[in-house]
Interface confidence: low
């Protein structure tokens, strides 16, 4: 039951990060939870950095300033692979709630 | 793939107007960065400036007389060069600014342009 | 503007040899955004090197470049006969992006 439940969890948790990544950054709660997410746990996107290439919202070639190794204002924008963290939130933060929740 | 097609005249008389086009094929022109690049003898390779998604970026030194402009109809992306001297004759290039990389990762094959009466 | 100069003008080496370019730059620029270009005659530069070491798509590996703040090089371990060209380095970190003169590599 415990395994269920934690995949449940882990994919309502996707479901959710999805969610908020297609409101950024036009809704400002959203944006900095989301920001808090990556910076904290140095991670980007849902699956990964490329998750935010198919958000309408943001320009092709950016990512929001949290997935940055050095996060400084618009570090995002002309972003380089390896100056980002690429590994995805769900599974980052997930293997975190795995242990914890 | 992306590909990219500049065109437009390769004679423009002094004082005028230089007008390019570039046509992108195997992609749409709404991702991406799409730049103009000058290459001459005197000055060698310099970057003009960029669309993206109608917001654009322009080397300083060319501001005042550049403007690049996209139709996303046509999947196009043009430049628009005023009051052109003899020092603007150059083989001018179309490129596209690749997401991840940033750099210049796909040319068109260039046109040359000629100021001159 | 971040002003890059590039060494030497000319290297005069033969097939198989070891070619070292040098690009330095005015001013620091972030290793993220510094490439490498080459060009043969009557042809488009092409990309060869991005953020200053990570090889660009179909670029055989004996393409490489490195260097951080204002000194890069990019290396090619042996020439091939189809390596003898014009290389340039370029700097997207600082608006406006800036080219070097480039170095011509020719045949000895």
């Known amino acids: 039951a415990g395994y269920v439940f934690r995949d449940k969890v882990m994919s309502e948790f996707n479901n959710n990060f999805r969610q908020q990544m297609e409101n950024y950054p036009k809704n400002n709660h959203t944006a900095s939870i989301l920001d808090r997410m990556q910076a904290d746990f140095k991670c980007c996107g849902a699956a990964n950095y490329t998750d935010w290439e198919k958000i309408p919202s943001m320009s092709k070639n950016r990512v929001p300033d949290s997935c940055c190794i050095n996060v400084t204002v618009g570090c995002g924008i002309n972003f380089n692979e390896k100056a980002i963290h690429k590994e995805g939130c769900v599974e980052k933060i997930g293997g975190w709630l795995r242990k914890n929740v | 793939q992306v590909q990219l097609q500049e065109s437009g005249p390769g004679l423009v008389k002094p004082s005028e107007t230089l007008s390019l086009t570039c046509t992108v094929s195997?992609?749409?022109?709404?991702?991406?960065?799409w730049n103009w690049i000058r290459q001459s003898p005197g000055k060698g390779l310099e970057w003009i400036g960029y669309t993206k998604k109608r917001s654009t970026n322009y080397n300083p030194s060319l501001r005042s007389r550049v403007t690049i402009s996209e139709d996303t109809s046509k999947n196009q992306f043009s430049l628009k060069m005023s009051s052109v001297t003899a020092a603007d004759t150059a083989v001018y290039y179309c490129a596209k600014m690749g997401w991840g990389s940033h750099a210049f990762d796909i040319w068109g094959q260039g046109t040359m342009v000629t100021v001159s009466s | 503007e971040i002003v890059l100069t590039q060494s030497p003008g000319t290297l005069s080496l033969s097939p198989g040899e070891r070619a070292t370019l040098s690009c330095r730059a005015s001013?620091?620029?972030?290793?993220?955004?510094l490439a490498w270009y080459q060009q043969k005659p009557g042809q488009a530069p092409r990309l060869l090197i991005y953020?200053?070491?990570s090889r660009a798509t179909g670029i055989p590996d004996r393409f490489s470049g490195s260097g951080s703040g204002t000194d890069f090089t990019l290396t090619i371990s042996r020439l091939e006969p189809e390596d003898f060209a014009v290389y340039y380095c370029?700097?997207?970190?600082?608006?406006?992006?800036?080219f070097g003169q480039g170095t011509k590599v020719e045949i000895k």
């Open positions: 953020g200053a070491s």
């Open positions: 370029q700097q997207y970190g600082s608006s406006p992006w800036t």
């Open positions: 001013q620091s620029v972030s290793s993220s955004y």
């Open positions: 195997g992609g749409s022109i709404s991702s991406y960065y």
